[in-house]
Amino acid sequence: SSPCPQAWGPPGVQYGQPGRSVKLCCPGVTAGDPVSWFRDGEPKLLQGPDSGLGHELVLAQADSTDEGTYICQTLDGALGGTVTLQLGYPPARPVVSCQAADYENFSCTWSPSQISGLPTRYLTSYRKKTVLGADSQRRSPSTGPWPCPQDPLGAARCVVHGAEFWSQYRINVTEVNPLGASTRLLDVSLQSILRPDPPQGLRVESVPGYPRRLRASWTYPASWPCQPHFLLKFRLQYRPAQHPAWSTVEPAGLEEVITDAVAGLPHAVRVSARDFLDAGTWSTWSPEAWGTPSTGTIPKEIPAWGQLHTQPEVEPQVDSPAPPRPSLQPHPRLLDHRDSVEQVAVLA
């Protein structure tokens, strides 16, 4: 058997650190057997069999010029083996961050904090954190650890499925290369890292007869669980074209009627989502949708709430083909005090 321990990495390659002493090991001989060392393709003897170092070659303060292939020969001139030297650095603790787009799963991503220049892999695992009380300390619940599957294999990302929203987890990401291993631990709670995906299907429609109104509607992001135990709340921003500043409102449900739009101007609208109990942070903004208030005259009498939702005679301007989901509750803004101002403006 070879006297050379096989480091993790390609076969026949041995590793060292720049500026440090490096020992190369002749793989095809018995430990302690004297050998001669040569650089591949070079006739000059680097170290003879009388060095007293047996099957090893010592390179003091290795640098990049020492990288390459070496040949070792036994006393009778037989090939003891070839060794390739690659220089690099031991692993440093990777940089790790975790994200959750829903309240049941989270993913963690990592990157090296220093480039080692060597073949590198990452071992990823996690466990549930539990602080045991005095009376319960003799019975530890199942807290792992479990592997955090890298998805897809080799990607700098692993995913934890079926996490508990109220629990805290510890993630272990260990960077491994032939010169060692280095671990980063990170404590994660879904409550703090939850950031929903932005709402989908944003549509902006005019309200016929109301030149200062736009109706915006949207749906939950597809990544949010189908039967949500946790609801989302929303934030809507709108602004007329060429206006730099956004107006912001927090709708009660999945639609909002804007009552102070600028007549005749296209308006950009976007929405963001957040857990309804303020866990985590707001999502990024949805792609903007555009709509222009109606230019027609108002109906002779102001319709009741239910009638306002009937299909208008004129096809509304729609940004997205997705149908709106009904609001979770009526919007009092539809018939608020601003209506009379709007009517006067239209009739004048």
Epitope: T130, V131, T143, P145, R170, S182, L185, D187
Partner: antibody, heavy 126, light 111 residues
């Protein structure tokens, strides 16, 4: 059953050395921060030393710095405290304890010891 | 690393409440939310009661509660019971050298 069992205590002369061991069972030792706490007879608790799960980082009370070394062997589920240059004031019951710790994206912090061993007595006397 | 300051003793009758203070500095108690409290009966190992200022581990009765204001943390034991007679210690992350620090200890007597 989650358990910590200390051993290695005894009587030692001033200037002498001793190595304490703490065998852990019932939990995944390699994931936890561990520490040593001592209590002199009739006195309060004194925080002695602390070690990260991988063993890469350690901490010591000023009173033992340079004399005591904490280490761990995760393959053996064992925590150690190597004590040199022992003094009379090191006489105490030494407890091994487990800590979940808290790890942010930049640092880990000592949090609270939730599991304690039964303690081992170290007496430094001539 | 100076020990955190606790009153040497506190007492109360069964059913009453008793509060124990733990005063440190902005480098320990005031600087981090890593304050814990322990109960120790004579001849026994300490037991964790409170961690991260206010959190109770599983199995610890809700009669024990923790709080913090500035550089001072407090443990309150309400509905005092005979078995609560013990020594109580606070502890905090020390802010340097990966170090922790304990309080001087408070002996609670149930009258």
């Amino acid at each position: 059953e989650v358990q910590l069992l200390e051993s290695g205590g005894g009587l030692v002369q001033p200037g002498g050395s001793l190595r304490l061991s703490c065998a852990a069972s019932g939990f995944t030792f390699s994931w936890y921060f561990m520490g040593w706490v001592r209590q002199a007879p009739g006195k309060g608790l004194e925080w002695v030393s602390y070690i990260y799960p991988s063993g890469g980082s350690t901490g010591y009370a000023d009173s033992v710095k340079g004399r005591f070394t904490i280490s761990r062997d995760n393959s053996k589920n064992t925590l150690y405290l190597q004590m040199h240059s022992l003094r009379a004031e090191d006489t105490a019951v030494y407890y091994c304890a487990r800590d979940e710790g808290y790890c942010s994206s930049t640092s880990c912090y000592f949090d609270a010891f939730d599991i304690w061993g039964q303690g081992t007595m170290v007496t430094v006397s001539s | 690393q100076s020990a955190l300051t606790q009153p040497p003793s506190a007492s109360g009758s069964p059913g009453q409440s008793v509060a124990i203070s733990c005063t440190g500095t902005s480098s320990d108690v005031g600087g981090y939310n890593f304050v814990s409290w322990y109960q120790q009966h004579p001849g026994k190992a300490p037991k964790l009661l409170i961690y991260e200022v206010t959190k109770r581990p599983s199995g610890v009765p809700d009669r024990f509660s923790g709080s913090k204001a500035g550089n001072t943390a407090s443990l309150t034991v309400s509905g005092l019971q005979a078995e609560d007679e013990a020594d109580y210690y606070c502890s905090s992350y020390g802010g340097s050298n990966n170090a922790g620090v304990f309080g001087t200890g408070t002996k609670v007597t149930v009258l």
